[in-house]
């Protein structure tokens, strides 16, 4: 499977809420011997590999924000911790998963990465990620609502480990 990022750039006014989205593409195993971790973190555009650095989102690590479940089950973070920081990550039955950030500030601007790790009972692991940019703007040039820009390429870096 791969991860698609429907939008590569989100431009939002300060104070607005935004939902960043990734989508799982391709066949997804729903067996009992597989589980999926889906999570979010901030990163930087590395010279070698985007999304290799995993920085917190509003002081919450990718471990704080992770969802895990089998197959296409829906899941979402009910963590009080995440909600106290104005964050919620969610996943549906159709391979979409997202993070919602409330009351955006200029400090929220940056590169965001979604990570999916498919872990099999018998020790193989498939990791894929997607990246998108969030720009939070203030002042007279800021849009009144979030404006999203579609990705030109929806491919993701991925690795299978056995």
């Amino acid at each position: 499977f791969k991860v698609a990022t429907p939008y590569s750039l989100y431009v939002c006014p300060e104070g607005q809420n935004v939902t960043l989205t990734c989508r799982l593409l391709g066949p997804v195993d729903k067996g009992h011997d597989v589980t999926f971790y889906k999570t979010w973190y901030r990163s930087s555009r590395g010279e070698v590999q985007t999304c290799s650095e995993r920085r917190p989102i509003r002081n919450l690590t990718f471990q704080d924000l992770h969802l895990h479940h089998g197959g296409h089950q829906a899941a979402n973070t009910s963590h009080d911790l995440a909600q106290r920081h104005g964050l919620e990550s969610a996943s549906d039955h159709h391979g979409n998963f997202s993070i919602t950030m409330r009351n955006l500030t200029l400090l929220d601007s940056g590169l965001y990465c979604c990570l999916v790790v498919e872990i099999r009972h018998h020790h193989s692991e498939h990791r894929v990620h997607g990246a998108m940019e969030l720009q939070v703007q203030t002042g007279k040039d800021a849009p009144s609502n979030c404006v999203v820009y579609p990705s030109s390429s929806q491919d993701s870096e991925n690795i299978t480990a056995a």
Partner: antibody, heavy 120, light 107 residues
Framework: QVQLVQSGAEVKKPGSSVKVSCKAS????????ISWVRQAPGQGLEWMGG????????NYAQKFQGRVTITADESTSTAYMELSSLRSEDTAVYYC?????????????WGQGTLVTVSS | DIQMTQSPSSLSASVGDRVTITCRAS??????LNWYQQKPGKAPKLLIY???SLQSGVPSRFSGSGSGTDFTLTISSLQPEDFATYYC?????????FGQGTKVEIK
């Protein structure tokens, strides 16, 4: 803050077995793989195997296959490593360590180590 | 299995020196390379993950670089507390494998 606390030092006879425990606190236990890594005196680090508690089944290095058993008890957030048919070369410090995610990503938290001495 | 080869196996350096340790993988591991520091009688401590990302709480004098098969750990200005043994480890696939270690000693 995540903490991994291991059981105390052991002295064993050749041919016997040893079981080392690793109790996790301060984080979600079930979701993260725990690996066991050993270090013989003056030597480097050697991965023995690991377990993801939600799966229950373990992943072993070929060298230890058949001689090591790694288990986890979700109710007590404790992982165990049992090594059988001990020989003098198994004298080492045994560490448990937690992966940040999945089977193979980096080991971010380590136990304090358990010295196992095999001697007749 | 993926073999990890570190060099040098030991080095002597003075406080303030720039120190470089290299690690080579027997096959491409993308950026899935981690560096650990170990002091005598203590457990290893994660310094760098994903080849170049600094683990939280680790001083910025430590840096990592590389991709594919060749990787480097650099300590820009060696401090007294940095005298230790350093290990690389691949996190590309199981079985996990470590380099044999590089001992950094006081000159």
């Amino acid at each position: 803050q995540v903490q991994l606390v291991q059981s105390g030092a052991e002295v064993k006879k050749p041919g016997s077995s040893v079981k080392v425990s690793c109790k996790a606190s301060g984080g979600t236990f079930s979701s993260y793989a725990i690996s066991w890594v050993r270090q013989a005196p003056g030597q480097g680090l050697e991965w023995m195997g690991g377990i993801i508690p939600i799966f229950g089944t373990a992943n072993y290095a070929q060298k230890f296959q058949g001689r090591v058993t790694i288990t986890a008890d979700e109710s007590t957030s404790t992982a165990y490593m049992e090594l059988s048919s001990l020989r003098s070369e198994d004298t080492a410090v045994y560490y448990c360590a937690r992966h940040v995610l999945g089977w193979v990503l980096e080991l971010d938290y380590w136990g304090q180590g358990t010295l196992v001495t095999v001697s007749s | 299995d993926i073999q990890m080869t570190q060099s040098p196996s030991s080095l002597s350096a003075s406080v303030g020196d720039r120190v470089t340790i290299t690690c080579r993988a027997s096959q491409s591991i993308s950026s899935y390379l981690n560096w650990y520091q170990q002091k005598p009688g203590k457990a290893p401590k994660l310094l760098i993950y994903a080849a170049s990302s600094l683990q939280s709480g680790v001083p910025s004098r430590f840096s990592g670089s590389g991709s594919g098969t060749d990787f480097t750990l650099t300590i820009s200005s060696l401090q007294p507390e940095d005298f230790a043994t350093y290990y690389c480890q691949q996190s590309y696939s199981t079985p996990l494998t470590f380099g044999q270690g590089t001992k950094v000693e006081i000159k």
